[in-house]
Amino acid sequence: PRSIDVKYIGVKSAYVSYDVQKRTIYLNITNTLNITNNNYYSVEVENITAQVQFAKTVIGKARLNNITHIGPLDMKQIDYTVPTVIAEEMSYMYDFCTLISIKVHNIVLMMQVTVTTTYFGHSEQISQERYQYVDCGRNTTYQLGQSEYLNVLQPQQ
């Protein structure tokens, strides 16, 4: 069998809402994956499991089942959404994300995704992880790749 390539493309959109009483931020983060089947037979994308971390804390998880099949030598782009919660334990983040004197409230999140594919009863898992910028201060739609976090250092605010 030839490889099945999984490429994490980036954040497509992030929609934010707040619970002022709980000082909590809710971010619905939609990500894009490209899955390429380099084989001469179809493969099933059985599930995608994803999680998002902020400051080494898992803030969101998602699982998609029975997603699609990919034909021979074909590629499919798949969007998946991870609902995340930055809760009261990170109270300072509520201040940051709702601060009107800052215009771009970028935070660095680690996106982790595992794709499980099956073919002829054989199962294969491919994982990716990537750091991404997400604006926690307003709803944002990104050009693919625009939110990539390239810097080794913490971003300047």
């Epitope: 707040y18 009483q21 300072y92 201040d95 601060l99 215009k103 201060g137």
Partner: antibody, heavy 119, light 112 residues
Framework: EVQLVESGGDLVKPGGSLKLSCVAS????????MSWVRQTPDKRLEWVAT????????YYPDSVKGRLTVSRDNAKNTLYLQMSSLKSEDTAIYYC????????????WGQGTTLTVSS | DIVMTQAAFSNPVTLGTSASISCRSS???????????LYWYLQKPGQSPQLLIY???NLASGVPNRFSSSGSGTDFTLRISRVEAEDVGVYYC?????????FGGGTKLEIK
Amino acid sequence: EVQLVESGGDLVKPGGSLKLSCVASGFTFSGYGMSWVRQTPDKRLEWVATISSGSFYIYYPDSVKGRLTVSRDNAKNTLYLQMSSLKSEDTAIYYCARQNFYYGCEDYWGQGTTLTVSS
Amino acid sequence: DIVMTQAAFSNPVTLGTSASISCRSSKSLLHSNGITYLYWYLQKPGQSPQLLIYQMSNLASGVPNRFSSSGSGTDFTLRISRVEAEDVGVYYCAQNLELPWTFGGGTKLEIK
């Protein structure tokens, strides 16, 4: 209904100190940043302080830095402005205002409290 | 600091007709995120300022749609389509693109 009620304004001599208060009601005070804005006798508006909802971020213009201190007590739904080394230029109506993070600005203002600095 | 400039008085308007109030900033208020950080407040006689317009062209909650606002990065106009008696007061533009946040000197709406 959002309500902001300022108090503490007075006649003070130059060099004196004063503490203004603003009691908030009708909304979850601990979830909103707050500001103080003053209106001088010539009706000009001047932003003088802002404080984030949990007091993690505080900003002042250079004109008042070191003389004015903003603080808040979320348990008491109260915003404060401690003023020291007062000058005649500080004479104004002082308004407290709530920041709306969706609008990105101050959306509700109190009725104001008057400070007069004069010998 | 960003300087906001307004005329002290509007051209006198008749009730029921339209009015325009202008404001100019010394620097573009258009951020790279596409938002223009320009605001309009109205201070009615004996009252505190009330928000009319946020981020250059958005009507604040409860504000009648007789009010509208437009502009470039530095030149802005507030329009009142049919002036009513209750619109009398001083209109302030403000910016919060950069600290310190600054206000215009205010324009008093004059009724004929």
